[in-house]
Interface confidence: low
């Protein structure tokens, strides 16, 4: 793994300028900055469909979560798409799985009080060779 | 973009909601979930017809400051023997997630939430075939 | 519309042969793998045999392995079951269906009968 | 191989309840799960496929939920013609196995 870094110089004559840490709760202005994405994934790209491990994707909505929707992919085959078209069951549609932070109401209904909170999504499938395991 | 309001009338706003100035939300960054992993298969970076190696951001100023992202090795896919098929394509799969920006101006310190796109993956593709007319 | 017809079904005496048949219509025959799922009388469904779209991949329940041998002929849009050393514990209704994804079985022929008995 | 087990395995119910059935998987089968109607005499009929999609032409009165290990198939309202035995399938690990299948009939 490569690692790629920046740094940003800061103030020198400021309070607690090598303060490295966040603290624990911060206000945030409430303007998400960078993109105003959330669609769906099937109107962004074909690869569900085109993949050689094609998914299907499932709206997971719930109203006290950041984004409110979040597309779920579940491989299609438990093989792959081979060149005839045909499931080649030698090889496996496996889930690619991504951790990401969402934010979630804090307390419960509350309109501007969130905390973060990491959650678990299959974003596609991709096709593998399997591991085989030989019996001694 | 604004945070939604939640839309659903037979939500109330409790009582307990704790006092916010205008314009900015409470953002509490200890993550719920924090141990929880991923439980994908082995290696699957290296196995799949699609590979791809990983390289860790690092930013100070970015809560959490390491955010993985993927390549992908080939612009084909590698077939039963092995070889690159350059007839099939390899393509990143992207996933949105959020990430906490510090901004310093000054000797102030303010806080932004930030989408960023990150590419999880690789999958082998049929390539899309433009006719010519 | 998606049409299978099993065919082949009889009565036979334990140890001896079958060749069931299913014509399929209104699919791409050859795009699809095909399954076999029997069922006992008066008992639940079992899962027999599943052949891959142009024949490569081929899988069998352990109760026929060794036994039953499926296959195919996408010119003639026919699925086959060779059974040999049939046992009374393969009575069943024999039936064929399509997979739409892996083991996703979303059409049904009506079934043939087969009674193995002395 | 993985052992679905239904319940119950007869339930007894007048037109317009309705009916519950439950399907439970001896290990996870994440949503690789159906629901099939096998009427006397015919082939099943696919209602439900991976935990909670309706097949081409089912009615809306048939909805599944679950995932993981317990699995329901919900009949809102029964109609005359929903009285027939339901099979649940799991199509997560090889074998495919079924569950045992569970009656309703007319109360």
């Known amino acids: 793994i490569v690692k790629a870094g920046i740094t940003i110089p800061r103030n020198p004559g400021c309070p607690n300028s090598e303060d490295k840490n966040f603290p624990r709760t911060v206000m945030v202005n409430l303007n998400i900055h960078n993109r105003n994405t959330n669609t769906n994934p099937k109107r962004s790209s074909d690869y569900y469909n085109r993949s050689t491990s094609p998914w299907n994707l499932h709206r997971n909505e719930d109203p006290e979560r950041y984004p409110s929707v979040i597309w779920e992919a579940k491989c299609r085959h438990l093989g792959c798409i081979n060149a005839d078209g045909n499931v080649d069951y030698h090889m496996n549609s496996v889930p690619i799985q991504q951790e990401i932070l969402v934010l979630r109401r804090e307390p419960p209904h509350c309109p501007n009080s969130f905390r973060l909170e990491k959650i678990l999504v299959s974003v596609g499938c991709t096709c593998v060779t399997p591991i085989v395991h030989h019996v001694a | 973009r604004k945070i939604p309001k939640v839309g659903h009338t037979f939500f109330q706003k409790p009582e307990s909601c704790p006092p916010v100035p205008g314009g900015s939300m409470k953002l509490d960054i200890g993550i719920i979930n924090e141990n929880q992993r991923v439980s994908m298969s082995r290696n699957i970076e290296s196995r799949s017809t699609s590979p791809w190696n990983y390289t860790v951001t690092w930013d100070p100023n970015r809560y959490p400051s390491e955010v993985v992202q993927a390549q992908c090795r080939n612009l084909g896919c590698i077939n039963a023997q092995g070889k690159e098929d350059i007839s099939m394509n390899s393509v990143p799969i992207q996933q949105e997630t959020l990430v906490v920006r510090r901004k310093h101006q000054g000797c102030s310190v303010s806080f932004q939430l930030e989408k960023v796109l990150v590419t999880v993956g690789c999958t082998c593709v049929t390539p899309v075939i433009h006719h010519v007319q | 519309e998606v049409q299978l017809l099993e065919s082949g079904g009889g009565l036979v005496q334990p140890g001896g042969s079958l060749r069931l048949s299913c014509a399929a219509s209104?699919?791409?025959?050859?795009?699809?793998?095909m399954n076999w799922v029997r069922q006992a009388p008066g008992k639940g469904l079992e899962w027999v045999s599943t052949i891959s779209g142009r024949g490569g991949s081929i899988y069998y329940a352990d109760s026929v392995k060794g036994r039953f041998t499926i296959s195919r002929d996408n010119s003639k849009n026919t699925l086959y079951l060779q059974m040999n050393s049939l046992r009374a514990e393969d009575t069943a209704v024999y039936y064929c269906a399509k997979e739409e994804a892996t083991w996703d079985f979303d059409y049904w022929g009506q079934g043939t009968t087969v009674t193995v008995s002395s | 191989e993985i052992v679905l087990t239904q319940s119950p395995a007869t339930l007894s119910l007048s037109p317009g309840e309705r009916a519950t059935l439950s399907c439970r998987a001896s290990?996870?089968?994440?949503?690789?799960l159906a629901w099939f109607q096998q009427k006397p005499g015919q082939a099943p009929r696919l209602l439900i496929y991976?935990?909670?999609n309706r097949a081409t032409g089912i009615p809306a009165r048939f909805s599944g939920s679950g995932s993981g290990t317990d699995f329901t198939l919900t009949i809102s309202s029964l109609e005359p013609e929903d009285f027939a035995v339901y099979y649940c399938?799991?199509?997560?690990?090889?074998?495919?196995?079924f569950g045992q299948g569970t009656k309703v009939e007319i109360k």
């Open positions: 290990q996870s089968v994440s949503s690789f």
């Open positions: 399938q799991q199509r997560s690990n090889w074998p495919p196995t």
């Open positions: 209104g699919f791409t025959f050859s795009s699809y793998a």
């Open positions: 991976d935990a909670s």
